[in-house]
């Protein structure tokens, strides 16, 4: 059919129409991390499961070595939740003792690395003081937003203290992105 | 017109292109819940408003009996916020009294039920220890991520204690999903 | 080319297919706010950066005077995070002194204004009691959901106390929307 032969070029000429199902997408889930020593201003990157359970990558969105690799330029929605858990932070006692009033905290940062740019870019940050009394504590930090990314950009999730990340369940700590 | 007759098959032959406006979508809002007995490891499902106010379902995404029914296979973004409110949890006193150091908590789980699969799958979990001092408390837990779902899958939102859910406003507690 | 002349009407006649890249989208980031007097039931709107750094508006989605202006009807995903920070709220002391047991709180509301409708509509609310002990505190509230909006609708983000908003970094406090 003449019409059938014409269709593909018709599609290309007039608009970058595309099937939604072939857009780059990924949902990564937590795995056990190396419990590293916690240093104040050094935020280690999490590593992730990319194919087992609920995790997947598709349509050229690849995961390698803690990074999601962006395969084509466009606007992406990027999200992550990290569930933290820890022992009681006795900051009330610290305060009473007259020491500096800087609370303990938990922080998640979604970072973009562009090879042609020397510095990583912090896209999203969730940071929370932790001043719990009387118990072990646990809580999530959720982040999500839309960003214009370039082909070759790399995304990672950094945390303030890797040893506090709850790695036990794939539904508690996760990281994803999809082309809009 | 001959062209009009041809168009649908033209669309099918080359790519599963589709109008964005006809994709399954739903945003459900909170309603008053039936107060149920709170059991430790049994998380009841919330029921929802699906057509009044801000709530809607469209394009074959249906809500019935606490479930969102997925009408076609694909990648969906699923989200929920539950606002909890409660009386003070005196876990600091509990601790001082030497009882077990297990904090009170609030939890939201977005669960997928597949009829052909015996066990529900937990897609997303937000869980937070609650150890407030000196006051009534209230706080939201937000969740959102992308999942590959199959036609016929059912989604629900479960919570650790239905009596703590703030059902007073449609903007405080909600549940939604849309095909990407 | 005859084919080229025909293409647009062919597209309109059969389905509202469109290039994803030309959909209205915006991601706004925090800027320093004008400190306003804090009134209990009056929630001031934040203003935003719309073109520097990570911020952008595109495809007729415009930002003006604290509002995102919706350029076409459809279903939008709308999101915001506001990071708050403050001094210790001694609500435990307040309680001990026998004064009313109403905790301090932080609240974010995403509001829709429709010129033809007298009252703004609250689309999303995140509200949290703040009863910290022993330290300065900081924490984010994240919101996101899908809504059916009409051309000409305006969106804004309101907060319970503008002086508590962390305006220091574009990744901590932000506001966005995109047509699905």
């Amino acid at each position: 059919l003449k019409g059938q032969e014409f269709a593909p070029s018709h599609q290309q000429v007039y608009a970058p129409l595309r099937a939604d199902g072939d857009k780059p997408r990924a949902h990564l889930t937590v795995v056990r991390q190396t419990p590293t020593q916690h240093f104040k201003n050094q935020f280690p990157a999490l590593h992730w499961e990319h194919e087992l359970g609920l995790a997947f990558t598709k349509n050229r969105m690849n995961y390698t070595n803690k990074f999601l690799l962006i395969p084509e330029s466009g606007d992406y929605f990027i999200y992550s939740q990290v569930t933290f858990r820890g022992m009681t932070s006795e900051c009330s006692e610290i305060r009473q003792a007259g020491r500096p009033n800087k609370p303990d905290s938990i922080t998640v940062v979604i970072t973009k690395v562009t090879d042609s740019y020397p510095e990583p870019t912090q896209l999203l940050m969730g940071t929370k003081s932790v001043c719990e009394v009387g118990s072990n504590w646990f809580q999530p930090i959720y982040l999500g937003a839309m960003f214009s990314l370039q082909e070759g950009d790399k995304l990672m999730v950094n945390v303030s203290d890797i040893s506090l990340v709850d790695y036990t369940k794939e539904d508690k700590t996760f990281f994803g992105a999809f082309l809009l | 017109l001959k062209g009009q007759e041809f168009a649908p098959s033209h669309q099918q032959v080359y790519a599963p292109l589709r109008a964005d406006g006809d994709k399954p979508r739903a945003h459900l809002t909170v309603v008053r819940q039936t107060p149920t007995q709170h059991f430790k490891n049994q998380f009841p499902a919330l029921h929802w408003e699906h057509e009044l106010g801000l709530a809607f379902t469209k394009n074959r995404m249906n809500y019935t009996n606490k479930f969102l029914l997925i009408p076609e296979s694909g990648d969906y973004f699923i989200y929920s916020q539950v606002t909890f409110r409660g009386m003070t949890s005196e876990c600091s006193e509990i601790r001082q009294a030497g009882r077990p150091n297990k904090p009170d908590s609030i939890t939201v789980v977005i669960t997928k039920v597949t009829d052909s699969y015996p066990e529900p799958t937990q897609l997303l979990m937000g869980t937070k220890s609650v150890c407030e001092v000196g006051s009534n408390w209230f706080q939201p837990i937000y969740l959102g991520a992308m999942f590959s779902l199959q036609e016929g899958d059912k989604l629900m939102v479960n919570v650790s204690d239905i009596s703590l859910v703030d059902y007073t406003k449609e903007d405080k507690t909600f549940f939604g999903a849309f095909l990407l | 080319l005859k084919g080229q002349e025909f293409a647009p009407s062919h597209q309109q006649v059969y389905a509202p297919l469109r290039a994803d890249g030309d959909k209205p989208r915006a991601h706004l980031t925090v800027v320093r706010q004008t400190p306003t007097q804090h009134f209990k039931n009056q929630f001031p709107a934040l203003h935003w950066e719309h073109e520097l750094g990570l911020a952008f508006t595109k495809n007729r989605m415009n930002y003006t005077n604290k509002f995102l202006l919706i350029p076409e009807s459809g279903d939008y995903f709308i999101y915001s995070q506001v990071t708050f920070r403050g001094m210790t709220s001694e609500c435990s002391e307040i309680r001990q002194a026998g004064r009313p047991n109403k905790p301090d709180s932080i609240t974010v509301v995403i509001t829709k204004v429709t010129d033809s409708y007298p009252e703004p509509t609250q689309l999303l609310m995140g509200t949290k009691s703040v009863c910290e002990v022993g330290s300065n505190w900081f924490q984010p509230i994240y919101l996101g959901a899908m809504f059916s909006l009409q051309e000409g609708d305006k969106l804004m983000v309101n907060v319970s106390d503008i002086s508590l908003v962390d305006y220091t970094k574009e990744d901590k406090t932000f506001f966005g929307a995109f047509l699905l």
């Epitope: 795995v31 056990r32 991390q33 190396t34 419990p35 590293t36 020593q37 916690h38 590593h47 499961e49 194919e51 087992l52 359970g53 858990r85 820890g86 022992m87 203290d161 040893s163 506090l164 036990t168 369940k169 794939e170 | - | -």
Partner: antibody, heavy 123, light 106 residues
Framework: QVQLQQWGAGLLKPSETLSLTCAVY????????WSWIRQPPGKGLEWIGE???????NYNPSLESRVTMSVDTSKNQFSLKLSSVTAADTAVYYC?????????????????WGKGTLVTVSS | DIQMTQSPSSLSASVGDRVTITCRAS??????LNWYQQKPGKAPKLLIY???SLQSGVPSRFSGSGSGTDFTLTISSLQPEDFASYFC????????FGQGTKLEIK
């Protein structure tokens, strides 16, 4: 050469609390997961749980309500408490070091084990 | 929890034989699988990690293979010191072990 030395009471009555300690010699205490595993007589291995140097724990859900683990980083020691024991808790209890490694992906294994402590629960 | 099923539960063989023990996971675990050897009255000893990597100091007659749900431990030529029990263990989620395979002298 890392070695794990463990000790604790070997004979308990039902409803008592089992208490074991494991000391780490000749190696780093941080950067690893410190596990407890048990093996009833003539049976297979059951993982009880683990703890990190910072005191973060992860327990087997089937035992979680009765288990408490703790660390003493000043002594490079970690401990297990199992409350309300019954005859079904009779087993050899092992401590072990777990570590995360990497090739093209991540994995986890327990490469150093204590000699084991037989704990018998009997009235 | 992920269930690990080993087969056979016991096996008789002779010195010099080639022996294969299999382990099946109840869901895909990619290569999150380890093999341990345990002799009577002793603690388990790590042989293979990540399904096929040989632990330092373990003789090369031991090898592991498999991915997803099906895994194999192979001893290419049995030596007298190899008669023991063998356990597989998954480390993808909450750690679980197989029920064990007892390798005895024929």
């Amino acid at each position: 050469q890392v070695q794990l030395q463990q000790w604790g009471a070997g004979l308990l009555k039902p409803s008592e609390t089992l208490s074991l300690t494991c000391a780490v010699y000749g190696g780093s205490f941080s950067g690893y997961y410190w596990s407890w595993i048990r093996q009833p007589p003539g049976k297979g291995l059951e993982w009880i749980g683990e703890i990190t140097h910072s005191g973060i724990t992860n327990y087997n859900p089937s035992l979680e309500s009765r288990v408490t683990m703790s660390v003493d980083t000043s002594k490079n020691q970690f401990s297990l408490k199992l409350s309300s024991v019954t005859a079904a808790d009779t087993a050899v209890y092992y401590c072990a070091r777990g570590q995360v490694g990497t090739t093209d992906y991540y994995y986890f294994y327990m490469d150093v084990w204590g000699k084991g402590t037989l704990v018998t629960v009997s009235s | 929890d992920i269930q690990m099923t080993q087969s056979p539960s016991s096996l008789s063989a002779s010195v010099g034989d080639r022996v294969t023990i299999t382990c099946r996971a109840s869901q895909s675990i990619r290569r999150y699988l380890n093999w341990y050897q345990q002799k009577p009255g002793k603690a388990p000893k790590l042989l293979i990690y990540a399904a096929s990597s040989l632990q330092s100091g373990v003789p090369s007659r031991f090898s592991g293979s498999g991915s997803g749900t099906d895994f194999t431990l192979t001893i290419s030529s049995l030596q007298p010191e190899d008669f023991a029990s063998y356990f597989c263990q998954q480390s993808y989620r909450t750690i679980t072990f197989g029920q064990g395979t007892k390798l005895e002298i024929k």
